[in-house]
């Protein structure tokens, strides 16, 4: 019988008949080791590979370039998959991006992009996006014209300032841009008026820090 093909992403996992959300192992092109990821099989048809998740502030997201490159945290909770893995996955085929957000009042919203990929490390993991829709604001809170990834030890933003140092976390900062889902986690009551919080400008404004976020990707042809 034909040898089983390894899963490239959570879409492959779903299409193989595994339709429960949870942790699965995927084999990404050009990556030497398999990678454990959280697969969301519930939202909008399932098949989503989670690349970022925030929910309780248990994980420190104020990290350097190398850690954002290779990832940190645990897919069972808060984590960043790793820019090298995100680059490798989104180089396999065309992907869309969905971002799920929740505020401290329990309101949920999402932003979705028809096309999503990032450049390689030499390109500072530059963000490429097209086709924004969703309920988290009419305008995109991610820079559509492209932005390089910055961390506290790698200042690639478009500002006279150092966005990643000032706003904390690694992100595709512009100057500094309308979002930062890797900012400081602030609890209820402490989450207003924060420059360096978990921000999605067109959902809750420039200084409201969100309660939970999930970034996930799925092939366009799913």
């Amino acid at each position: 019988r034909e040898e089983e093909k390894p899963f490239r992403d959570c879409a492959d996992v779903y299409q193989a008949g595994f339709n429960k959300s949870g942790i699965y192992t995927i084999y990404i092109n050009n990556m030497p080791e398999p990678k454990k990821v959280f697969c969301n099989m519930d939202v909008n048809g399932g098949g989503w590979t989670v690349i970022q998740h925030r929910e309780d502030g248990s994980l420190d997201f104020q990290r350097g370039w190398k850690e954002y490159k290779m990832g940190f945290g645990n897919p069972s909770g808060e984590y960043w998959l790793g820019n090298e893995f995100i680059f490798a996955i989104t180089s396999q085929r065309q992907y869309m991006l969905r971002i799920e957000l929740m505020d401290w009042e329990g309101n949920r919203a999402y932003s979705q992009y028809d096309r999503f990929h990032i450049g390689n490390e030499k390109q500072n993991y530059r963000l490429y996006l097209k086709g924004h829709t969703g309920t988290a604001g009419k305008q995109s809170s991610l820079i559509l014209h492209g932005a390089d990834f910055s961390t506290k030890d790698a200042d690639n933003d478009n500002c006279m300032c150092k966005c990643a140092l000032m706003l904390t976390g690694g992100w595709w900062f512009d100057a500094c841009g309308p979002s930062n889902l890797n900012g400081m986690f602030y609890t209820a009551g402490q989450n207003h008026g924060k420059l360096n919080g978990i921000k999605w400008h067109y959902f809750k404004g420039p200084s409201y820090s969100l309660r939970s976020t999930t970034m996930m990707i799925r092939p366009l042809d799913f």
């Epitope: 006279m160 100057a175 500094c176 841009g177 924060k194 420059l195």
Partner: antibody, heavy 122, light 112 residues
Amino acid sequence: EVQLVQSGGGVVQPGRSLRLSCAASGFTFSSYGMHWVRQAPGKGLEWVSYISSSGSTIYYADSVKGRFTISRDNAKNSLYLQMNSLRAEDTAVYYCARDLLDYDIWTGYGYWGQGTLVTVSS
Amino acid sequence: DIVMTQSPLSLPVTPGEPASISCRSSQSLLHSNGYNYLDWYLQKPGQSPQLLIYLGSNRASGVPDRFSGSGSGTDFTLKISRVEAEDVGVYYCMQATHWPPTFGQGTKLEIK
């Protein structure tokens, strides 16, 4: 390269009007709050007015409230200051200045125009 | 309005020597978000002001590392570790924690 090029200054009699312009280039103008700051001859700096990126929020210094009007045209990448009922004490070099950070996060003036002199004299 | 008081108002310095400018505010500039909205600007002769330090201690891009800002609450300091001839001009502190934004009266740095 970020540029703020000012125009519209000159000599005007007390009680008359003048309109200053500030043409922006090299950045996404519609994403930034903008300010007017002035400097009387031989004196220090004084903040005059602020307008948010969309134009929905506007503030004025008490010394100009009711006489000056700040506005912006994001389609033309331009900032304006309409100055009415001018007084001798309004004589100053007027600077337009851009917020350091986008999306109306206040952290100071990242870029300044070259300044334009307004002289109010009879 | 918040009153910003700088000292000294005049500062003659020998090239290569350090320099220090103090800025005091009439109320605390420490915002509830943990930031001090205090900037330092330099206005060189015949030029527009330029941003040196933002949020109390953050050096703007392109500003030499001989410039540093420190302080919190009501007392702030701008230090130049080794003054160079190109550093001459008037230095202003400015607060934006409380509306309206207000400037200090300026400190004129000159070379001895």
